[in-house]
């Protein structure tokens, strides 16, 4: 054997080296790779050093017996049956509340004759639940509502008002509360005729009534 070269590098089971016929002189770099379903154990890159020894020990190719980490999914949590995802392991994704799952909830790591083990499906997605809108409420008699839409998105507010001479009984603004189904925060108000009795009573005034014959107050009723 020549004494100015590094030793010959052998082939390794379930893998190959490149270049396949390397010059064994100082500075030569050899890369080992594994066949599908196997992974390199040790250093895959060896270099012929000044002292004519290889920089690393010979690597080996080991059967891949686990799946890669399928990753986290936004707006979800995951339950893992085995931390290193070996063949047979499961990962269950559960969407956070208010989100819906698109795809498979449970992934299983399956072995393959050729190649590395693979997940039964791709990771799912968790999408924001579409909240149903509230149906439009009719305007109160002798009143109006704004906006005058038939459907109001969750979170929207509608406002009520009354015609002159009428007062609002109930909430002037009500909200479409998000939910399943979405619902109005309060019943729609009503518009009631403004009465003078009500007007005076609300101010706690004592009003002396005039005789019936000339009662402008009674006439106003």
């Amino acid at each position: 054997p020549r004494n100015d070269t590094c030793p010959e590098l052998p082939e390794i089971p379930n893998g190959w080296k490149s270049p396949s016929q390397p010059e064994l002189v100082h500075g030569t770099v050899v890369t080992y790779q594994c066949y599908p379903g196997y992974q390199v154990v040790g250093s895959s890159v060896l270099m012929c050093q000044w002292d004519l020894t290889w920089s690393e020990d010979l690597p080996s190719c080991q059967r891949v017996t686990s799946c890669h980490d399928p990753g986290d999914v936004e707006h979800s949590r995951r339950l893992i049956s085995s931390p290193k995802f070996p063949v047979g392991a499961t990962v269950q994704y559960i969407c956070d509340q208010g989100f819906v799952l698109m795809g498979s909830s449970i992934l299983t790591c399956h072995d393959r004759q050729a190649g590395s083990p693979k997940w039964s499906d791709r990771a799912p997605k968790c999408l924001l639940e579409q909240l149903k809108p509230c149906h439009g409420l009719s305007a109160p008699e002798n009143g109006a509502r704004s906006p005058e839409k038939q459907l109001h998105p969750a979170g929207a507010t509608i406002h009520f008002s009354c015609a002159p001479g009428y007062v609002l009984k109930g909430q002037a603004s009500i909200k479409c509360v998000p939910g399943h189904p979405s619902h109005w925060s309060d019943p729609p108000p009503i518009c009631r005729a403004a009465s003078l009795d009500g007007f005076y009573n609300s101010r706690s005034l004592d009003v002396a009534k005039a005789p019936a014959a000339s009662s402008t107050l009674d006439a106003a009723h």
């Epitope: 339950l79 049956s81 956070d96 509340q97």
Partner: antibody, heavy 117, light 106 residues
Framework: EVQLQQSGPELMKPGASVKMSCKAS????????MHWVKQNQGKSLEWIGE????????GYNQKFKGKATLTVDKSSSTAYMDLRSLTSEDSAVYYC??????????WGQGTTLTVSS | QIVLTQSPAIMSASPGEKVTMTCSAS?????MHWYQQKSGTSPKRWIY???KLASGVPARFSGSGSGTSYSLTISNMEAEDAATYYC?????????FGGGTKLEIK
């Protein structure tokens, strides 16, 4: 009637490990995930993690990874929680609680853990 | 993680009085759940999915809210309602709890 029966109080030394149990009855054990919740002396509640008794799948609150280990024994309908490298910070009441669809519908009576030298 | 802040931390009410306690979330959430805990006992699910009463909970209790603001209301306070109430969310993992509102009877 759903019942979650937890193991008795524990007095442990710092650095030790403890294993507490939660035996479920009154429902099909594998139909519901089991959660563990910590309540410290200040009375606040913290979610530790959960286990799916059917698949054995486990999920942890990042804060308790490395501290708690959750397991189940389907044959006895029992959930377990191991706590390691105990410190005084781990002194608390620990509850198991059944999954109630984003909340916790049934709770065990709690296991009191005291860590003291 | 989402932080839930309950207020007030402690309150007292007379029998028959209307009581409202609130739970504020650091980010918008879809639903809120509430638990009742009496001294020396485990928490009980009280209100779930914002407004649904758990089995056996009296009709004087109600829950409401959306976004970042939620509340639990008792229409007529009774002595047996004296307890600590915790809110909880799972619109974002990990689920989190509020610090509790301790309700005392006057």
């Amino acid at each position: 009637e759903v019942q979650l029966q937890q193991s008795g109080p524990e007095l442990m030394k710092p650095g030790a490990s403890v294993k507490m149990s939660c035996k479920a009855s009154g429902y099909i054990f594998t139909d519901y995930n089991m959660h563990w919740v910590k309540q410290n002396q200040g009375k606040s509640l913290e979610w530790i993690g959960e286990v799916n008794p059917n698949t054995g799948g486990i999920g942890y609150n990042q804060k308790f990874k490395g501290k708690a280990t959750l397991t189940v024994d389907k044959s006895s309908s029992t959930a377990y929680m191991d706590l390691r490298s105990l410190t005084s910070e781990d002194s608390a009441v620990y509850y198991c609680a059944r999954d109630g669809n984003y909340c916790f519908d049934y709770w065990g009576q709690g296991t009191t853990l005291t860590v003291s030298s | 993680q989402i932080v839930l802040t309950q207020s007030p931390a402690i309150m007292s009410a007379s029998p028959g009085e209307k009581v409202t306690m609130t739970c504020s979330a650091s980010s918008s959430i879809s639903y809120m759940h509430w638990y009742q805990q009496k001294s020396g006992t485990s928490p009980k699910r009280w209100i779930y999915d914002t407004s649904k009463l758990a089995s056996g909970v009296p009709a004087r209790f109600s829950g409401s809210g959306s976004g970042t603001s939620y509340s639990l209301t008792i229409s007529n306070m009774e002595a047996e309602d004296a307890a600590t109430y915790y809110c909880q969310q799972w619109s974002s993992t990990p689920p989190t709890f509020g610090g509790g509102t301790k309700l005392e009877i006057k």
